[in-house]
């Protein structure tokens, strides 16, 4: 006990009475108003609990501190006395705070500041939208991803900062009368082949696409090693003279130095040098069938296959290379007799005829072109006279029907002996290659040596055999008149052809038999 | 008639580099190669490359490669040969001609002459 | 690439004497092209394609020769064809010149 009559134990925030009691401090409270024991204790009131009495007024806040409180005025507000704290109603001076004026760029950049009572908003720019992670930050909208597919379906998307437009895609271009950009923008496909826009490579033919297009190897052409066909880069080389050389077994130094002058010319080939590789070509051939040189000692049966090979090879090459030539009609002439006559022509509904000194040809122009060949239709004829010195006594096969009408109408006068080649041998090539069963004949007519009295004319073709050899034939083929220096001949296929005398005895005359090429 | 019209003569310091032109007329440009050739003051002729002026092709010795760009302009028929680098070797009259495999170069440019000098 | 030799370098000849020079390839040519030069003036294509005469070419020049071995003859010499020739190839990339046959009146 304290002698001066004031209790020592009394507990914490607790002031004495007397000396057996204490009271709890203003602002705390205890179970009883006058604490009698030390277990008791005094605890703070919390004066902004709901049931208080304490009013701090509108736009403040109470605080309740250790034994007391403060009013003060809430976030968005200041008070207008600027006493930051107040303990009641009618001290209160707290009003709204301009947050956008007291700092113009609170909504950072693409967002109008709006005061509202307490606070502020952001209000994005069109093409903005607040950031949910912070509502006071304005992003970009991405009208493309947004789901709302703003543009036409001829164009694609491209946002930008707080826009977007509508392109045109790559390879399209906008509707006559149509922006490129707004949202309204419709394109249509860019056919770049015939606008001129396309970087395709001359060995190669364009093909529109949508939306773009590809380079396609000419026909004849195959891509150069290594670049893929039908690309935008393709490039192409000819294949017309890469698979032109000596056929295998024959060794011959004049074929082998003919043959050479063909991969020259193809070694550096490009699609504007037609015209003087295919008169170098057949420059070549002139000079070779003129002076034949060490093919001239070859046994008959390899100049037979020489001869065939030559043959079969001018055809390819001259068609490959004609596909390249500009509309018209081209006549060249050699030395030696060789003789080519071309014309190239945008598909047309006629028949055409091309004349030489020994021969001339009549077919139908339908028949020049494959259907959906993009090239131009070509139709050739080639006279090669030198090329009779190889073929002599090639073989005449004739079809059983024929053999065995022969036999009958000429029992016994059948002679040994080869057929004996009466005109110059002629090559004819359309820009088409499939030429074995024309929808119409061809017609030639020959102009030749003078017949023998009482000999078999005959129309052949030459016959590729498959031993890359062959012979004459007769098969679709027929003669449809002779006189004494010329024949007509009338056949349902392409090859080289040629007028034989045969040493057939002929008796009367005889309807059989007399075929063309 | 065919004709290749070379551009006038260059005096260029070393290192610069000068373009020539040959405008070809009279005849179809693409149907031929487009060859360049060098000679040197009392010396022979020496090819430096090829342009085709259909698709830009070109062949070049190797010794030119990096030294000549070949180029053809087929809307105006002109070629054009740009020499880099330029040093006193250099220094030649440079040809252009028409040329085919079979045929040679049967037409020639009056040449130009490049003269380098410091 | 194709080497050419020409001989002789030079050579020289009276009026009315038959020329002959050579050109000869270290690899098979199949088309050899020769050329007249003279001082100050652009090349002259002459013979082409190893014996065809260039247009305006006088019927005394000849070419022939086949493979890596190639001739070029003047049958009767004449002041006007003192000159220098050279042989061309473009069988394979690069082309190539021979070095050149200087032919001088004697």
């Known amino acids: 006990q304290d002698s001066r009559g004031c209790a020592r134990w009394c507990p914490q925030d607790s002031s004495c009475v007397n000396a057996t009691a204490c009271r709890c401090n203003p602002g705390f409270s205890s179970f009883s108003e006058i604490i009698t024991t030390p277990m008791e204790t005094c605890d703070d009131i919390n004066e902004c609990a709901t049931l208080s009495k304490v009013s701090c007024g509108k736009f403040s806040d109470c605080w309740n501190t250790e034994g007391s409180y403060d009013c003060v005025c809430s976030p968005g507000y200041e008070p207008v006395s600027g006493a930051k704290t107040f303990k009641n109603e009618s001290e209160n001076t707290c009003q709204d705070v301009d947050e956008c004026q007291q700092n113009p760029r609170l909504c950072k950049s693409y967002g109008t500041c709006v005061n509202t009572l307490g606070s502020y908003t952001c209000q994005c720019l069109p093409g903005f939208k607040l950031k949910p992670e912070d509502p006071k930050l304005c992003t970009d909208v991405n009208e493309c991803t947004s789901g709302q597919n703003p543009c036409h379906s001829s164009t694609h998307c491209l946002n930008n900062v707080g826009s977007y437009q509508c392109r045109c895609r790559p390879g399209w271009q906008p509707i006559p009368g149509s922006p490129n950009g707004p949202n309204n923008t419709v394109c249509e496909d860019v056919d770049e082949c015939s606008s001129g826009q396309h970087q395709c490579d001359s060995s190669t033919v364009c093909f529109n696409t949508v939306g773009s297009y590809s380079c396609r190897c000419r026909p004849g052409w195959k891509p150069r090693h290594g670049i893929p066909n039908n690309q935008k880069d393709t490039v192409c080389e000819d294949m017309t003279f890469s698979t032109w050389t000596p056929p295998p077994g024959v060794h011959s130094q004049t074929l082998s130095r003919f043959f050479d002058k063909v991969q020259d010319l193809g070694r550096d080939y490009k699609p504007g040098l037609a015209n003087n590789t295919i008169q170098s070509i057949l420059q070549a051939l002139d000079e070779l069938l003129e002076a034949p040189g060490d093919l001239e000692t070859l046994p008959r049966l390899q100049q037979h296959c020489v001869a065939s090979h030559l043959l079969d090879g001018l055809e390819d090459v001259l068609r490959g290379l004609s596909k390249n030539l500009s509309n018209g009609l081209l006549n060249f002439s050699y030395p030696a007799g060789t003789e080519l006559s071309l014309e190239v022509q945008k598909q047309v509904d006629r028949s055409v005829t091309l004349r030489q000194n020994q021969a001339v040809m009549q077919l139908d122009w339908n028949q020049a072109q494959k259907s959906g060949d993009p090239g131009p239709s070509v139709v050739g004829l080639v006279s090669i006279p030198g090329m009779g010195k190889l073929l002599a006594e090639a073989p005449l096969v004739l079809e059983p029907e024929k053999q065995m009408l022969l036999h009958e109408t000429h029992q016994g006068l059948l002679q040994d002996g080869s057929p004996i080649l009466l005109s110059d041998v002629i090559s004819a090539f359309l820009s088409n290659n499939d030429t074995q069963n024309l929808s119409s004949p061809v017609t030639f007519t020959f102009s030749h040596r003078s017949v023998i009295p009482r000999q078999k004319v005959l129309c052949v073709f030459w016959e590729h055999g498959q031993n890359g050899c062959g012979h004459w034939a007769t098969t679709g083929c027929s003669t449809i008149g002779t006189r004494d220096t010329s024949t007509i001949c009338r056949c349902t296929h392409l090859s080289s052809f040629a007028v034989l005398m045969a040493h057939y005895d002929v008796q009367e005359e005889d309807p059989v038999l007399t075929v063309i090429t | 008639q065919v004709q290749l019209q070379q551009s006038g003569a260059e005096l260029a310091r070393p290192g610069a580099s000068v373009k020539l032109s040959c405008k070809a007329s009279g005849y179809t440009f693409t149907n031929y190669w487009m060859q360049w050739i060098k000679q040197r003051p009392g010396q022979g002729l020496e090819w430096i490359g090829a342009v085709y002026p259909g698709d830009g092709d070109t062949r070049h010795t190797q010794k030119f490669k990096g030294k000549a760009t070949l180029t053809a302009d087929k809307s105006s028929s002109t070629a054009y040969m740009q020499v880099s680098s330029l040093a006193s070797e250099d220094s030649a009259v440079y040809y252009c001609?028409?040329?085919?495999?079979?045929?040679?170069?049967?037409?020639w440019g009056q040449g130009t002459s490049v003269t380098v000098s410091s | 690439q194709i080497v050419l030799t020409q001989s002789p370098a030079v050579m020289s000849a009276s009026p009315g004497e038959k020329v002959t020079m050579t050109c000869s390839a270290s690899?098979?040519?199949?088309?050899m092209h020769w050329y007249q030069q003279k001082s100050g003036t652009s090349p002259k294509r002459w013979i082409y394609?190893?014996?065809k005469l260039a247009s305006g070419v006088p019927n005394r020049f000849s070419g022939s020769g086949s493979g890596t071995s190639y001739s070029f003859t003047i049958r009767s010499m004449e002041a006007e064809d003192a000159a220098t020739y050279y042989c061309?190839?473009?069988?394979?990339?690069?082309?190539?010149f021979g070095a050149g046959t200087k032919l001088e009146l004697k």
């Open positions: 690899s098979s040519v199949s088309y």
């Open positions: 061309q190839q473009w069988s394979s990339n690069p082309l190539t």
């Open positions: 001609a028409r040329g085919f495999t079979a045929y040679g170069m049967d037409y």
């Open positions: 394609d190893t014996s």
